[in-house]
Each structure stands twice: as C-alpha cells, then as structure tokens.
Interface confidence: low
C-alpha cells in the first residue's frame, strides 16, 4: 500500500492515485504539496514572508480546539491535534457523531440524532431525557385520592323509580356493590364524565371498565377524550398529526378492564371522556394513569413488594389480644394490603412512634399515599403525620414547611380505606424515610406507598 507508511507529513491524509505507485496528499491548512512539508507563506504588514503555525488558521471544524502536538516523523514543523467538542469526531472534527447509535432512549423511545446532540420521543407512559422515568401510575380514581367532588358528569341515570342513582363518583375502577358505576341518563344525547385533577398533571392513559346493571352487561365500546386547563375551554385529543378526533377502543364486556395510552401524553387539569358507542346504557368504571408534571412520581414498591419486608421497620408493634397470629408488623404497612391483619399498628399511641422505609440508595421522594385499616371491625387510621429523612439511618431531619419554617404536618386519612396522597414539594432526596404519626383515630395504623424515582440519569 503506497499510503502505508503515510508519506504525507504534518497530519496530511494520503490518497492513492489511479496509476500504480502514485498518491496525493490532502494537506491541513498551513501546509502544501507535494508531501505537506512546505509551509504556506503568509505576507505580513511589512510584506515580510512569515510562517503560520499549523493552528493558524484553525484547521479544526465545528468549534474544535487546535493544539500543537509532538512532531510527527521528524517533520520540519511540529504537527497539531484537534480536540473536538462533544458530538463531533474526525481528524478535523468534521464528523457529527450519531448519538443514536448507542441507543440512549430507553423503554421504546425513538431517538433523533441532532447536531452534537440527540432527542428521545418517548412513548406516552415514559418521560425524561432518555425516557427513563415511568409515568403510568394510577392517579387515584380507584383508590380514592380523587374525591367524589372531582368526578362530575353530564347526567346520572336513575332506576327503580329514582331509588337507584348511578352517580359519576361511582365510576371507580373495580368498584363493587349493587350500584357500582356511573351510567348516563337515557335521554342524555351527548354524555360525558369529567375528572378534575385539581392541578395540571401529565395524563398518559386511561383504563375503562363496564358493569352489570340489573343483571345486564353494559359498557362503553368506544370513546373520545377531551382536556382542559380551566374546565371551560376544551380540546379534543386528536389522531397524531391530523385534525381528526381520536376514537379510543373501549370495552367488550362488563368486567374486563381495557387500557389505552396517550402518545403524546395530555398535560391538563381536567379530563373528559365522551362515550361514542355503548352496549345498552353508557356505563363506566375507570382510572386515569399518569404522574405529576415533573415526572418522578411512580410507586417505589411498598404495594408491589419491590420494597422488601426487611426494609420496613417501626418503633413498636401491636398484637391484637396479645396473640402472635394477630401481629400488626411494619412489613404489612403496604398500600391496599388485604387480610385480617393487613397494616402496621404501633404498640403505643404517642407522638414518638414511627414507620421507617430503607430505600437502600438515596432516592428522590416526591409523594406519599397513606391508608388506615380495620382491626376486627374497629376503624383505625393516622389523621396527620410528619416526615423525617436520613442518609445514614441515625441522623434525622424532619421535613419542613418552607413558608412557615417549622415541621410540616401532612393531612392523613379520615377513614380506614380511602387513599390519601400528599405531594412532597420540594422533594426529599434521601435513603431512609420515616412517617411520624401526629394524630390518629383508634390506634396508630398505617398502610402506605412512597412515590418518586431513583437517582436521575
């Protein structure tokens, strides 16, 4: 190979010629043919011939920095090296690196290579620079975080001479009972049901479910979605890239939940569902999926079991009738836990009690959901609480109310079963979290979930 070793000096690039044994050199600025050994002479003001170094003018493209380097092969002039900014490479920083080659977008995100950068288009239920944050947790229709007052509708069906009323606030996923869903009135020509999230949130999906009404399956077969920030001006969710309303597939029976995701997600305070096709009456149970606008509000694993039993500890434990089989251990303090003994209850009712979760690594905690429980029919719950956090498990800081500059007291539960969510803003960044019950009903009793995300990428 005529170009090996490289006959071109001072960083020149050797190009083999058409004829055997011939070559040409592509010389960096400041040098000239035939072997890039001749210095280009630049006339000065005094019209005296002077020599420009290899870095003048700058041979490096795209903002690269030219640095004089050690001599190559004992050339007359010392050579140079281009230090390229992020996103570029090549001898002269002439190549834009394709950042998408290393697949930075997680969870099905679509990568677009930009100049010295990239962007990820995330599926609706994920967000973040690399689609690393999940944003598809239930927003609280089923659990009760979303209160009755937040769920309204165009009409309510009344049956049995008006004795049965299928109110909008019955439209909670998996609701049980004789009247367990919302049904629109028969004469409602354009029915809708609306959720007021009370603040702008990121909504990434919806789960719908029908119900049996008077023994007959009823459900919404397809629907449209609208959203608003003031409850007055509404926008219909469109088919991406068109002006056509998106018609979402609904249910095919009265009980199987069916989920649809929103890509792109909706960012709004109000969400409205408009039934389009109904089996008999328009009857619905539902849940909205999503997260806070900032993202990072996914369950950290109390309910799912990702947080293991050994990570949950407490100040004391209560035993009903002093029997081991009725021990209300900290490991049972998991949101929605079922069974006779399905929560943590403290051994003492005082303000020095605590429930502690070790998240194993420093974690961003942006919210908390609490729930009470029943001990053999006795309703028990924590009505208010404080939070403390620590990184070593020994030195604790009580979470402060920024405005009042004192310990923040979070509002807790008012019954044994409804979820109560509190947003932690600003978030806690710590390994250990403690719930400090401040007031209670019956005995101090907790089921809970922490919301947040692991360390940001």
């Amino acid at each position: 190979d005529i170009c090996d070793p490289n006959p071109c000096e001072n960083g020149g690039i050797c190009l083999p010629g058409l004829a055997d044994g011939s070559f040409s050199c592509e010389c960096p600025d400041g040098f000239t043919d035939p072997n890039c050994s001749s210095v280009v002479e630049v006339a000065s003001d005094e019209e005296e011939p002077t020599s420009a170094g290899p870095c003048t003018p700058n041979p490096c493209h795209n903002g690269g920095t030219c640095e004089i380097s050690e001599a190559y092969r004992g050339d007359t002039f010392i050579g140079y090296v281009c230090k390229c900014p992020r996103g570029f490479n090549g001898i002269h920083c002439q190549h834009n690196i394709n950042e998408c080659e290393v697949e930075p977008c997680k969870n099905g995100g679509i990568c677009t290579d930009l100049v010295a950068n990239y962007s990820c288009e995330c599926p609706g239920e994920f967000m973040g620079r690399n689609c690393q944050y999940k944003c598809s947790g239930p927003l609280g229709i089923e659990g009760g975080i979303i209160s009755n007052q937040q769920i309204t509708a165009s009409s309510t069906h009344r049956a049995l001479f008006g004795l049965q009323k299928w109110y909008p606030y019955y439209a909670r996923l998996n609701k049980k009972g004789l009247i367990n869903a919302w049904t629109a009135a028969e004469n409602d020509r354009w029915p809708w049901i609306q959720i007021n999230l009370q603040r702008k949130m990121r909504v990434t999906g919806v789960i719908t479910q029908g119900a049996k009404r008077i023994g007959s399956p009823e459900y919404i077969k397809s629907y449209k979605i609208a959203y608003s920030n003031d409850g007055k001006t509404w926008a219909m969710y469109k088919v991406k890239g068109t002006n056509e309303d998106m018609v979402f597939r609904g249910n095919i029976d009265n009980n199987t939940p069916y989920a649809n995701s929103f890509t792109p997600p909706i960012k709004a305070q109000y969400v409205r569902l408009y039934p389009q096709v109904c089996r008999r009456h328009c009857t619905l149970r539902m849940e909205l999926l999503g997260c806070e606008l900032s993202g990072c509000s996914e369950p950290l694993g109390m309910k799912s079991g990702h947080i293991q039993d050994y990570q949950i500890t407490a100040s004391s434990i209560f035993r009903t009738l002093n029997m081991d089989m009725f021990t209300w251990e900290p490991r049972k303090a998991r949101l929605d836990k079922q069974g006779k003994v399905n929560a943590w209850t403290s051994g003492h009712n005082d303000q020095s009690q605590w429930l502690q979760v070790d998240l194993l690594v420093p974690t961003k905690v942006t919210g908390i959901i609490t729930q009470g429980a029943k001990d053999f029919g006795h309703v028990q719950f924590v009505g208010s609480y404080k939070l403390a956090y620590s990184n070593d498990g020994e030195h604790w800081t009580v979470y402060q109310d920024e405005k009042q500059r004192k310990d923040k007291v979070f509002q807790g539960n008012f019954d044994n079963d409804t979820h109560r969510k509190n947003v932690i803003d600003p978030p806690i960044y710590a390994r250990h979290i403690r719930i400090l019950p401040w007031s209670w009903y019956g005995r101090i009793t907790l089921r809970s979930e922490l919301l947040g995300c692991t360390e940001e990428e």
């Epitope: 409602d188 020509r189 399956p217 597939r249 389009q276 096709v277 008999r280």
Partner: antibody, heavy 126, light 107 residues
C-alpha cells in the same frame, strides 16, 4: 351498499367439519361486531355465535360451544365459522349478520342485526 | 338463558285488518327487544328496535310497544306484501334469543 355473502356450505357426514365464510363489503367491516345466526329447515331463528369488531372477544350459544369457532380477518373483510364434530341437528341455513349500530345523539347502542347475508345451507347427514 | 314466547304461532287475517302479535320474556329485559320480518326463502329484516322504534325505511303501519316482560307487535292495516313470519328477539343478555316465530297468512 352493504353486502354480506356467505359461502362454504354443503353436505357433510356426522362428525365431519366445515368452514363457512362471509365476505363483507359496503361498510367498514373492522368497526362492527358480527354474528352467525342459523335456521333449521321449517324452524325458527337461532343465534349461534358473535365476535367483537377486533376479534378479541367471542361468544357462543351453549349448543355449539367447544365445537364451533368464530373468527375474522379484518384485512380481508371476511368472517368465518369453523364447524367441527358436526351433528344432524346442526343442519340449517347459516346467515352472517352485522351487529347494527343505531345512533342516538352522540351515542350508539348495540344489539341489532340490521344487515344479513342470503345464507348458506349446511346439511349434516350420512 | 332468557326464553322468548311468541303467540300466536300462526294467524290468518284479511287485507286491511289490524294484526297483533305478542312476545313474552322469561325475565325483565327492559326495552331491549327487536322485531324481524322473514319472507320465504329470504333473510330476516329488522322492522322494530328497542321495542317501539321503527327502523329507517319501514312503513309506518308497523309498530311495537311494551317494556319489561310483555311486548306487542302491531300491523295497523294488513297488506298483501306483509305475508311473512315475524320474530321477536331479545338482546338484554347473551345468548341472544328469538321467539319461535308467528306465521302470518292472508285469508
């Protein structure tokens, strides 16, 4: 104009199999639930099976459950009924029917057979 | 399953007569009942839906009424082309069930 055209009927021995097809045209096939309804010679109508618009959900009369399978190919606008372990009492004209959509304001209520094919005769006899 | 009982099973009437067919459900089906007409050698045709609503294009001499378990189908003035078998059908619940049919003849 909505058209439903059944085919695949014929004479088959007891215990045998047959596959009926229903070619649909004149409407958006993938948006509608479909059913098979049969009528034994000189007898009344009997609903046999139904399938949801996507094909994800199927329903059967007790008399055919486990022997008949309803399916659809939305890309071909075709409804199918695979009939196995046929019995003499399965002898009938088989109709495919579109589960109709009656609009009431912004809402549509399901439960009608408003378009039917001309039927195909299935005879099960030795 | 919901049983649908139609009566009479057959009837004979003169042109211009008022004809009434009844259908009884074995349980409450609200108004989730349809009526079909089937002429010999033809597929059934939907006439009435939701117990009392006339399907588009169907002559106004046909009507339906009733709710719960008892339903009535009426032809106010019988025409020669009305010779057919008439079926009621419930869709309150699966399986969908039909009445046994009423055969209508001209005297």
């Amino acid at each position: 104009e909505v058209q439903l055209l059944e085919s695949g009927g014929g004479l088959v021995q007891p215990g045998g199999s047959l596959r009926l097809s229903c070619a649909a045209s004149g409407f958006t096939f993938s948006s509608y639930a479909m059913s098979w309804v049969r009528q034994a010679p000189g007898k009344g109508l009997e609903w046999v099976s139904a399938i949801s618009d996507s094909g994800g959900s199927t329903y059967y009369a007790d008399s055919v459950k486990g022997r008949f399978t309803i399916s659809r190919d939305n890309s071909k606008n075709t409804l199918y009924l695979q009939m196995n372990s046929l019995r003499a009492e399965d002898t009938a004209v088989y109709y495919c029917a579109q589960e109709g959509l009656i609009t009431f304001g912004g809402v549509i209520v399901i439960g009608y057979f408003d378009y039917w094919g001309q039927g195909t005769l299935v005879t099960v006899s030795s | 399953d919901i049983q649908m009982t139609q009566s009479p099973s057959s009837l004979s009437a003169s042109v211009g007569d008022r004809v009434t067919i009844t259908c009884q459900a074995s349980q409450d089906i609200s108004n989730y009942l349809n009526w079909y007409q089937q002429k010999p050698g033809k597929a059934p045709k939907l006439l009435i839906y939701d117990a009392s609503n006339l399907e588009t294009g169907v002559p106004s001499r046909f009507s339906g009424s009733g709710s719960g378990t008892d339903f009535t189908f009426t032809i106010s003035s019988l025409q020669p082309e009305d010779i057919a078998t008439y079926y009621c059908q419930q869709y309150d619940n699966l399986p969908i069930t039909f009445g046994q049919g009423t055969r209508l003849e001209i005297k």
